[in-house]
């Protein structure tokens, strides 16, 4: 069960490292993304800043130090960043009072650049990934995830933040991204509606049913607000979800609890699980580029890593994801994705030779972009 161009094992051509929703940012349609039926109306990108508070609910987490007591460090409830910007795109304004960034929605007013000028920046996310044009970078080594296997206790917080469903992650989950290390803060999903796909990134214009984002904070920064807008300050792991013949047991641990948080702002506790099981198994084939959060504040400098391999969920599971939650204003929480944004000269890098038979519809040979990291 593979969608065109993206298969469980075949190159998806997905975005690259980034955090798309760490702060709860949403994606507005971009000039490069011509409106399509499944794309929610978006806002135009005007030039703007990128260091506003985070998008979704990014916890202001300090990297744990060896000397800190484990009870205080690991066991106290994780704190979310104010504003909970990482909530999914809804078709209504949030009722919360607070900074401007709490008042945004998918499709419609206010225009995102008005909510956060950074949303009009030149290097925004998500983008359309064209494997044929990706630059093969042998220096992009297989991703390493450390500490992503969590025992069932203590439990983790699963929340409907009005823009998405978000799982807050505890301290200790680390990703090795190139020479740096990143701490995972939270993960959230983007989806469509019945019969309508809702991934944020696309591959050669193909939109997948859904997309998972695992938002990370660089160990070079102690807090999310310090990292916003700084190159490499945030990193997001992204993977496409598509329909397969079998139930995905890892996702079922979360999807089976969605009814409990159907109402916007509600939350529940779920047993710890193997977070890496929510991601594709092939950590060696991925696309990477520098972009932004996909929801306000749309801060740039985010490293996006998009897996080439997809994750398979059953049709019933995909339906549960898109048809259970409610957002603000008595509207269903659906189509919570931002339209793709123009690359504006950015080159998407690939950890594998994606331009070679990476797509079922391989066109005539294309001059591949060169890898900036070549020789590293």
């Amino acid at each position: 069960q593979r969608l065109p161009r993206m298969q469980e094992d075949s190159p998806l051509g997905g975005g690259s490292s980034g955090e798309d929703d760490p702060l709860g940012e949403e994606d507005l349609p971009s000039e490069e993304d011509s409106p399509r039926e499944e794309d929610p109306p978006g806002e135009e990108d005007l030039p703007g800043e990128e260091d506003l508070p985070g998008e979704e609910d990014l916890p202001e987490v300090k990297p744990k130090s060896e000397e800190e007591g484990s009870l205080k460090l690991e066991d106290l409830p994780t704190v979310e960043a104010p504003g909970d910007p990482q909530e999914p795109q809804n078709n209504a304004h949030r009722d919360k009072e607070g900074d401007d960034q709490s008042h945004w929605r998918y499709g419609g007013d206010p225009p995102w650049p008005r909510v956060s000028p950074a949303c009009a920046g030149r290097f925004q996310s998500p983008v359309d990934i064209r494997p044929q044009l990706a630059a093969f970078c042998p220096a992009l080594r297989p991703l390493e995830l450390l500490g992503f296997q969590l025992p069932p206790l203590p439990e983790l917080r699963l929340r409907n933040n009005g823009h998405s469903v978000q799982l807050t992650l505890p301290p200790g989950l680390e990703m090795a991204l190139g020479p740096g290390r990143e701490y995972a803060l939270q993960l959230h999903l983007h989806w469509g509606a019945a019969g309508r796909p809702g991934s944020e990134h696309t591959v050669e214009g193909h939109r997948f049913p859904a997309e998972i984002h695992v938002v990370h904070l660089s160990t070079a920064f102690a807090r999310v607000d310090e990292a916003l807008g700084r190159p490499g300050g945030l990193a997001v792991l992204a993977a496409f979800l598509e329909e397969g013949p079998e139930e995905n047991s890892a996702y079922e641990q979360l999807l089976s609890r969605l009814e409990e948080i159907a109402e916007e702002g509600s939350e529940t506790q779920v047993p710890g699980l193997d977070i890496s099981a929510l991601l594709p198994s092939d950590f060696s084939r991925y696309f990477q580029y520098e972009g932004s959060l996909t929801t306000p504040p749309c801060a740039q400098g985010v490293i996006w890593t998009v897996f080439n391999q997809t994750v398979m969920l059953s049709a019933k599971q995909l339906h549960t994801l898109s048809d259970t939650l409610w957002g603000p204003g008595d509207s269903r929480l659906q189509l919570n994705f931002r339209a793709t944004q123009p690359l504006n000269g950015r080159v998407i890098e690939a950890s594998f030779p994606a331009g070679v038979d990476s797509s079922p519809r391989a066109a005539e040979p294309v001059q591949l972009n060169s890898c900036l990291a070549a020789g590293d």
């Epitope: 060896e66 007591g69 484990s70 009870l71 690991e74 066991d75 106290l76 409830p77 500490g147 992503f148 296997q149 969590l150 025992p151 069932p152 206790l153 203590p154 439990e155 505890p170 301290p171 200790g172 506790q269 047993p271 710890g272 193997d274 890496s276």
Partner: antibody, heavy 119, light 112 residues
Framework: QVQLVQSGGGLVQPGGSLRLSCAAS????????MSWVRQAPGKGLEWVSA????????YYADSVKGRFTISRDNSKNTLYLQMNSLRAEDTAVYYC????????????WGQGTMVTVSS | QSVLTQPPSVSGAPGQRVTISCTGS?????????VHWYQQLPGTAPKLLIY???NRPSGVPDRFSGSKSGTSASLAIIGLQADDEADYYC???????????FGGGTKLTVLG
């Protein structure tokens, strides 16, 4: 200061029952998962049971499943272990422990209480 | 028999370095679950010594360190002292058995 104070141990006949208590102080008890761990005389540590912070989810070792019941009263900051159908092999020092560490470690331990099952 | 295997005993002279191994399987340590270490002095409750493979809670001397590789983990103690004499336990989670597992314990004897 952070501490767990246990009570309720003692001598009981095989087939009998006993309830252990563990009173927490110095930390937000209701925010933490808790466990019971036991140690038979001269032996190693054995995890017995665990309960989520809100009490909604419980876990048991196969050796006690169906006989022991873990519970908590967050309003009283107290953890319990109801032990029924006790057997000689249940003889041990029972410790309550804070299961709150996200990496799966037991951060804080009670002082332990001895349970002896003998006729 | 414990799923996490430790040597029953180790010994060393004051000032020396000793290591205690903990060997698991693909359903616990090898699956990626963290390893934690506890020290139990005679007649007392266990005390958390290392959590998350390598981290020391506040108050634990830096003479104690932990490491993990593959399906095994190790606890190292340098500058051995007489009051380090105790039982040491490793612990992890087993996803197949669905239990929090302890190793069988290792008795550390400080010689002379």
């Amino acid at each position: 200061q952070v501490q767990l104070v246990q009570s309720g141990g003692g001598l009981v006949q095989p087939g009998g029952s006993l309830r252990l208590s563990c009173a927490a102080s110095g930390f937000p008890f209701s925010s933490y998962a808790m466990s019971w761990v036991r140690q038979a005389p001269g032996k190693g540590l054995e995890w017995v049971s665990a309960i989520s912070a809100n009490g909604g989810t419980t876990y048991y070792a196969d050796s006690v499943k169906g006989r022991f019941t873990i519970s908590r009263d967050n309003s009283k900051n107290t953890l319990y272990l109801q032990m029924n159908s006790l057997r000689a092999e249940d003889t041990a020092v029972y410790y309550c422990a804070n299961n709150g560490n996200y990496r799966g470690a037991f951060d804080i331990w009670g002082q332990g209480t001895m349970v002896t099952v003998s006729s | 028999q414990s799923v996490l295997t430790q040597p029953p005993s180790v010994s060393g002279a004051p000032g020396q370095r000793v290591t205690i191994s903990c060997t698991g399987s693909s359903s616990n340590i090898g699956a990626g679950y963290d390893v934690h270490w506890y020290q139990q002095l005679p007649g007392t409750a266990p005390k958390l010594l290392i959590y998350g493979n390598t981290n020391r809670p506040s108050g634990v001397p830096d003479r104690f360190s932990g490491s993990k590789s593959g399906t095994s983990a190790s606890l190292a103690i340098i500058g051995l002292q007489a009051d380090d004499e105790a039982d040491y336990y490793c612990q992890s989670y087993d996803s197949t058995l669905r239990v929090w597992m302890f190793g069988g314990g290792t008795k550390l004897t400080v010689l002379g």
